[in-house]
Amino acid sequence: MMTGTIETTGNISAEKGGSIILQCHLSSTTAQVTQVNWEQQDQLLAICNADLGWHISPSFKDRVAPGPGLGLTLQSLTVNDTGEYFCIYHTYPDGTYTGRIFLEVLESSVAEHGARFQIP
């Protein structure tokens, strides 16, 4: 029986050009975590496998760093990075647990203020 729960950072925001840590935590189970996938709906960002280590998708190699821990760091954020991110924990003997994080990438404060400035 699957007793565990995934805790995530939920809905988060970050500034364009900045970085953010995507973090999930599996609790309330003694199951062994053997692999964690980080995904968007239609593509895989990274896999952390207990035996094989980290694999980062070539599409994200320049902007994604493994860790901390089983988390994932997204760098040089763009507005296009806004959206859902999923952590998928493969465990033994429970099976898979999944969590969702929604990231909103905002224009930087400077850009926001600039946008509000109007010439009289």
């Epitope: 692999q35 996938n37 995904e39 709906q41 239609d42 593509q43 895989l44 896999i47 496998n49 094989l52 694999h55 998708s57 070539p58 599409s59 859902e84 999923f86 998928i88 493969h90 898979t96 999944t98 969590g99 969702r100």
Partner: antibody
């Protein structure tokens, strides 16, 4: 239990359209993506595309853009795939499928029984 | 698109034998590969996901292994009911792609 019930076999004329349905039951319809897969007689499997019934958002295999249109009706928990400008190449069994986990990877744990579409004059 | 190649269209085996079906990806897909069984006239059935994880209720005679570009699906002791076509599929990126299938025939 999770079930995906597809509409019955269709015999259609070349150049026309057909709409295949996939009625979901046993789970919260809007929480899980629905995928569509094509299988020509005696052939392998081809992924057509995916729809998020909650938002209506979809993603298509480039090969099926302009051929397939995916929609979903939340009120009846039914996903639809419309195929247009039919030719003999579209004669196939079409499956709807659902991912195993709410936010899970694209492995397909639940499948409809398939709908045979035959295009013939 | 990522091409998944199953080099054997057919494999012949006997009940009780061990049989392995291979699948090769055209690029590194890490461990993002699933295996399905399709019996005549039926829908595909998920057996393995993420290369080596057995789906709920799947008998333990079915196993998967591999990473990167080379993957193997093994039946440790073939039963008569295992007569089917077996497909690999990458769940690494869109569009999802399947291998051409390997038909397992029982001698």
């Amino acid at each position: 239990q999770v079930q995906l019930q597809q509409s019955g076999a269709e015999l259609v004329r070349p150049g026309t359209s057909v709409k295949v349905s996939c009625k979901a039951s046993g789970y919260a319809f809007t929480n899980y993506l629905i995928e569509w897969v094509k299988q020509r007689p005696g052939q392998g499997l081809e992924w057509i595309g995916v729809i998020n019934p909650g938002s209506g958002g979809n993603n298509y295999n480039e090969k099926f853009k302009g051929k397939a249109t995916l929609t979903a009706d939340k009120s009846s928990s039914t996903a639809y795939m419309q195929l247009s400008s039919l030719t003999s190449d579209d004669s196939a069994v079409y499956f709807c499928a659902r991912r195993g986990d709410k936010y899970g990877s694209a492995w397909f744990a639940y499948w409809g029984q398939g709908t045979l579409v035959t295009v013939s004059a | 698109d990522i091409v998944m190649t199953q080099s054997h269209k057919f494999m012949s085996t006997s009940v009780g034998d061990r049989v392995s079906i291979t699948c090769k990806a055209s690029q590194d897909v890490s461990t993002a590969v699933a295996w399905y069984q399709q019996k005549p006239g039926q829908s595909p059935k998920l057996l393995i996901y993420s290369a080596s994880y057995r789906y709920t209720g799947v008998p333990d005679r079915f196993t998967g292994s591999g990473s990167g570009t080379d993957f193997t699906f093994t039946i440790s002791s073939v039963q008569a009911e295992d007569l089917a076509v077996y497909y690999c599929q990458q769940h690494y990126s869109s569009p999802r792609t399947f291998g051409g299938g390997t038909k397992l025939e029982i001698k």
